[in-house]
């Protein structure tokens, strides 16, 4: 039987696709640095096939290697805004179970208003990922400017 | 049958590997924002597996969840340069069917010379793909500095 | 058969998922502007499915279209640092064998104290890719903050 | 809680200056802007300037050649002169915080005002 | 600079009806998926009180009668229903870029 035929018989999840693209809901409470994401068709163009939102963090289903990427503008920001205002740093980490808490990517707006990144790293199933904004400026909701996502790459 | 041997007798194609990497080819006339792009092994690591250019804009042939990225590089450019012009963006998005027209993905260049970012987005079989380079900086054609593509990621 | 299963009985490295993530070990002598890189379970989250280390430097194992990234951000740095310096520039390239020697991607730290980009690009068996830091600041050696990877797309 | 307390000379001079200190508490000038305002019958509510965390400022274009806003962040202290001042300067000046997000550019706490005359 | 005009300048409203207040702003205040307005309430002889950040966030301690609605260049400030406290002078405030300016005002009074 022809691979190809075989790829349709079989749901996508058992081939180990998983992938998500979320976009920005809001920010946390003033204490919580936090981003709360959320994600689905409903919403444009973000998804979640395979991990899932637990309060606005992004949960890991299938254990593998995943490329992470982020992009995170912020909003009326020029790069006098920037300037002006103590650094702000981005942080996307694994902050559940706290048992594998990491910082997995770190950056810094200097006197720029947008940051995106992106790496290789090994995920569990249950790995929860947080991405803390330090810093004093709101981030910009636009889902082409500020985005977040997650593609299962290998086991 | 070992799949690597089924996998060696099947086109790619079927397998759903839709890739491509361009570089620069020119600017449009003045009122024209877009980046007009080129791809193929005679212009060096350039290459189009799958999608197409059509008048140096990216023509997707198979619907999927796709990484997108893309770098560019401003010509003869420092920060101060950067600084003393009108800010210059770069957004990529679907520009034609008109009907899907979106803004994907967008970066300012504030102090800097360069922008690189990356996403995940769902794109269908005919959507094109438009770069538009707004300001009156001139992108580099160094084709380790500005460049632009796409990878199917799952369908 | 079901895929799934088969995908079990094969050994991963059929499949093509050549991978890597490095973390950064050391710079180079004085006059060496390479970046040297390590990695492995032991030092954390970097690894290397396929690929391996050949003093510091990353050789390719099987012949492909890869997804290049690099993130590295100088140790010590706000923008006030960068800009006092003269430009720091990393360029990614193939830097053996001599006869396919070539840069792949180049990014400068204008006023900004990281660079993280990303591009596909065709790899061969025996290609050893190269990162050049070039300037007088020293990158940071944290993991989440500098790191450099592959990933084998597709044949 | 989160306090600006206000103090300064109402009347002034004309052509003379005007000095007034914001002295807060309840938060840190090392997170949170300052704003300054002024509301005059003629005029209603007119944005007069920011010092940001840190400690740089942005003023109102129309008011740029004769103010000047300054803090000592130690002191929990925010300083606005204003030089040559008019009949038509005639207003309440506030200091008012802006909330933990410095792009929001709101102001959530306000201090009680100060009245000022300008009469010789 | 960006001009607000409010209106009405003044209304009556009756005790547990609904007062709507409009602010227009001469271009759009909207950026980063965001509508920079807010609102605030000025009872005589005291500072502003900020009622609703962005548009539509109320602030914290602010009773659930006061909304805020709108985007764009077109925004509405409800309260519903009107009690006696809501008596007051209304200001609409811009913040998509520097100067930051203010409306006119409008004075609610309760018949």
């Known amino acids: 039987q022809r691979f190809a035929q075989a790829q349709q018989q079989l749901p996508l999840e058992s081939l180990g696709w998983d992938v998500a693209e979320l976009q920005l809901n809001h920010t946390g409470p003033q204490q919580d640095p936090r981003l709360y994401w959320q994600g689905g068709p409903a919403l444009g163009r973000s998804f979640l096939h395979g991990p899932e939102l637990d309060k606005g963090q992004l949960r890991i289903h299938r254990d593998g290697i995943y490329m992470v990427h982020i992009q995170v503008t912020l909003a009326i920001c020029s790069s006098t805004t920037a300037s002006r205002h103590h650094p702000t740093t981005l942080a996307v980490g694994i902050c559940s179970p706290a048992s594998r808490s990491i910082s997995l990517l770190r950056l810094s707006f200097h006197q720029g208003c947008t940051i995106a990144s992106q790496r290789l790293t090994p995920l569990a199933r249950g790995d929860t990922l947080c991405t803390n904004l330090t810093g004093t400026l709101l981030p910009s909701r636009n889902t082409d400017e500020t985005f977040f996502g997650v593609q299962w790459v290998r086991p | 049958q070992r799949f690597a041997q089924a996998q060696q007798q099947l086109p790619l194609e079927s397998l759903g590997w839709d890739v491509a990497e361009l570089q620069l080819n020119h600017t449009g006339p003045q009122q024209d924002p877009r980046l007009y792009w080129q791809g193929g092994p005679a212009l060096g690591r350039s290459f189009l597996h799958g999608p197409e250019l059509d008048k140096g804009q990216l023509r997707i042939h198979r619907d999927g969840i796709y990484m997108v990225h893309i770098q560019v590089t401003l010509a003869i450019c420092s920060s101060t340069t950067a600084s003393r012009h009108h800010p210059t963006t770069l957004a990529v998005g679907i520009c034609s069917p008109a009907s899907r027209s979106i803004s994907l993905l967008r970066l300012s260049f504030h102090q800097g010379c360069t922008i690189a970012s990356q996403r995940l987005t769902p794109l269908a079989r005919g959507d094109t793909l438009c770069t538009n380079l707004t300001g009156t900086l001139l992108p580099s054609r160094n084709t380790d500095e500005t460049f632009f593509g796409v990878q199917w990621v799952r369908p | 058969q079901r895929f799934a299963q088969a995908q079990q009985q094969l050994p991963l490295e059929s499949l093509g998922w050549d991978v890597a993530e490095l973390q950064l070990n050391h710079t180079g002598p004085q006059q060496d502007p390479r970046l040297y890189w390590q990695g492995g379970p032991a030092l954390g989250r970097s690894f290397l499915h396929g690929p391996e280390l050949d003093k510091g430097q990353l050789r390719i194992h099987r012949d492909g279209i890869y997804m290049v990234h690099i993130q590295v951000t100088l140790a010590i740095c706000s923008s006030t640092t960068a800009s006092r310096h003269h430009p720091t520039t990393l360029a990614v390239g193939i830097c053996s064998p001599a006869s396919r020697s070539i840069s792949l991607l180049r990014l400068s730290f204008h006023q900004g104290c990281t660079i993280a980009s990303q591009r596909l690009t065709p790899l061969a068996r025996g290609d050893t890719l190269c990162t050049n830091l070039t300037g007088t600041l020293l990158p940071s050696r944290n993991t989440d903050e500098t790191f450099f990877g592959v990933q084998w797309v597709r044949p | 809680q989160v306090q600006l307390q206000q103090s300064g000379p109402g009347l002034v001079q004309p052509s003379q200056s005007l000095s007034i200190t914001c002295t807060v508490s309840g938060f840190s000038l090392t997170t949170y802007a300052v704003h300054w305002v002024r509301q005059s019958p003629g005029k209603g509510l007119e944005w007069l300037g920011v010092?940001?965390?840190?400690?740089?400022?942005d003023y109102n274009a129309a008011f740029i050649s004769r103010l000047s806003i300054s803090k000592d962040n130690s002191k929990s202290q925010v300083f606005f002169k204003m030089n040559s001042l008019q009949s038509d300067d005639i207003a309440i000046y506030y200091c008012a915080r802006n909330p933990y997000y410095g792009n929001l550019n709101a102001m959530d706490y306000w201090g009680q005002g100060t009245s000022v005359t300008v009469s010789s | 600079d960006i001009v607000l005009t409010q209106s009405p300048a003044s209304l009556a409203v009756s005790l547990g009806q609904r007062a709507t207040i409009s602010c227009r702003a001469s271009k759009s205040v909207d950026t980063s998926g965001y509508s920079f307005m807010h609102w605030y309430q000025q009872k005589p002889g005291q500072p502003p009180k900020l009622l609703i950040y962005l548009a539509s966030n109320l602030e914290s301690g602010v009773p659930a009668r006061f909304s805020g609605s709108g985007s764009g260049t077109d925004f509405t400030l409800n309260i519903h229903p009107v009690e006696e406290e809501d008596a007051a002078t209304y200001y609409c405030q811009h913040s998509r870029e520097l100067p930051l300016t203010f409306g006119a005002g409008t004075k609610l009074e309760l018949k």
């Open positions: 010092i940001w965390s840190t400690g740089i400022t």
